[in-house]
């Protein structure tokens, strides 16, 4: 057992059919020494008596919120939440595997530059009585800041029968360095806890590794006189680290006929523009990659031939 | 009608053990919260153990500090409490009940502790 924060404690169970739990004291936090009673919940009945009561926790029916009172007048409360243990692993029933880019991959995480600003995001199908809390730190056994704001739900999605929940969170390294060649990992705890039953997930990576740049900006087309060429131009996003020619993108540039059948034709430059053919009802698009460490492109900036 | 009868006190030595039985009759031990409790020559009565309904899980006064264990045999709708390392401060009558307050109690059975 330990505490999750002021008189919430996890209890962590060996979860298999008669198992036999965990013996877990509770004391009332009070000066008063007799006449002490405990009940559970919402319910009068009577657990025991005494400053300190040992109870043996093996299911969901004994976690819950354990009050001790006095003469009908309460003097502190301590909330049990289960963290269940099956054939040596640790339950994630509340998160969904976004299998992307591999299976048990529950967290997943973007940085937009190297600024050490980043965010996070999990997904659920559980809409009520559903807390998240999120710690990080560069490294783990000397941790360095890092700060981590409220996570929020951000979207909603129908998936066939269930409704999907997309919670996020973002988080800032409190001491970054951009151009700094990293050493030690991102780490990130998220403690999930629905009803009573605690879980935690975590995710370990490099800023590098998980940058996806925000897309081209200002794209535009300039035909050019007498050929069905066009002149391609756009500009780095302006979330991108500087300067630019430090912190360097490199770009796709494709032209996509209407029929997502027809044969794309894909140019890849280091130059913020590039001459390509317009077909009609085509349309341009443009994508961005960190020029020297092969993460994420970013998402398509788009316009049409026409 | 509704009775709970205990047996299996007796005198022990310091260190020793007995196993309390708690026979029901009229109601379903296993649908309900089960205590025992004890009461010393000249005190009051006090708690020792709780069993809950469902998996069956226990609670114990501090005083227990693992010698005792609670459970019961929903076939045979008794409850028990076995005593180990016995010592003279848990000479007692010991009663089970069916509530908190003690309206459904039997007589009790007693337990001496004495070289």
């Known amino acids: 057992i330990w505490e999750l924060k002021k008189d919430v404690y996890v209890v962590e169970l060996d979860w298999y059919p008669d198992a036999p739990g965990e013996m877990v004291v509770l004391t009332c936090d009070t000066p008063e020494e007799d006449g002490i009673t405990w009940t559970l919940d919402q319910s009068s009945e009577v657990l025991g008596s005494g400053k300190t009561l040992t109870i043996q926790v093996k299911e969901f029916g004994d976690a819950g919120q354990y009050t001790c009172h006095k003469g009908g007048e309460v003097l502190s409360h301590s909330l049990l939440l289960l963290h269940k243990k099956e054939d040596g692993i640790w339950s994630t029933d509340i998160l969904k595997d976004q299998k992307e880019p591999k299976n048990k991959t529950f967290l997943r995480c973007e940085a937009k530059n190297y600024s050490g600003r980043f965010t996070c995001w999990w997904l659920t199908t559980i809409s009520t009585d559903l807390t998240f809390s999120v710690k990080s730190s560069r490294g783990s056994s000397d941790p360095q800041g890092v700060t981590c704001g409220a996570a929020t739900l951000s979207a909603e999605r129908v998936r066939g029968d269930n409704k999907e929940y997309e919670y996020s969170v973002e988080c800032q390294e409190d001491s970054a360095c951009p151009a700094a060649e990293e050493s030690l990992p991102i780490e990130v705890m998220v403690d999930a806890v629905h009803k009573l039953k605690y879980e935690n997930y975590t995710s370990s990576f490099f800023i590098r590794d998980i940058i996806k740049p925000d897309p081209p900006k200002n794209l535009q087309l300039k035909p050019l006189k007498n050929s069905r060429q066009v002149e391609v131009s756009w500009e780095y996003p302006d979330t991108w680290s500087t300067p630019h020619s430090y912190f360097s993108l490199t770009f796709c540039v494709q032209v996509q006929g209407k029929s997502k059948r027809e044969k794309k034709d894909r140019v890849f430059t280091d130059k913020t523009s590039a001459t390509v053919i317009c077909r009609k009802n085509a349309s341009i698009s443009v994508r961005a990659q960190d020029r020297y460490y092969s993460s994420s492109w970013s998402e398509w900036a788009s316009v049409p031939c026409s | 009608e509704v009775q709970l009868v205990e047996s299996g006190g007796g005198l022990v030595q310091p260190g020793g053990s007995l196993r309390l039985s708690c026979a029901a009759s009229g109601f379903s031990i296993s649908n309900n919260w089960m205590y025992w409790f004890r009461q010393a020559p000249g005190k009051g009565h006090e708690w020792v153990s709780t069993?809950?309904?469902?998996?069956?899980?226990?609670a114990y006064a501090d005083f227990v500090k693992g010698r005792f264990t609670i459970s019961r045999d929903n076939a045979k709708n008794t409850l028990y409490l076995q005593m180990n390392s016995l010592k003279p401060e848990d000479t007692a009558l010991y009663y089970c009940a069916r509530d908190w307050a003690g309206t459904v109690r039997g007589q009790g059975t007693q337990v001496t502790v004495s070289s």
């Open positions: 069993i809950k309904t469902g998996a069956g899980s226990t």
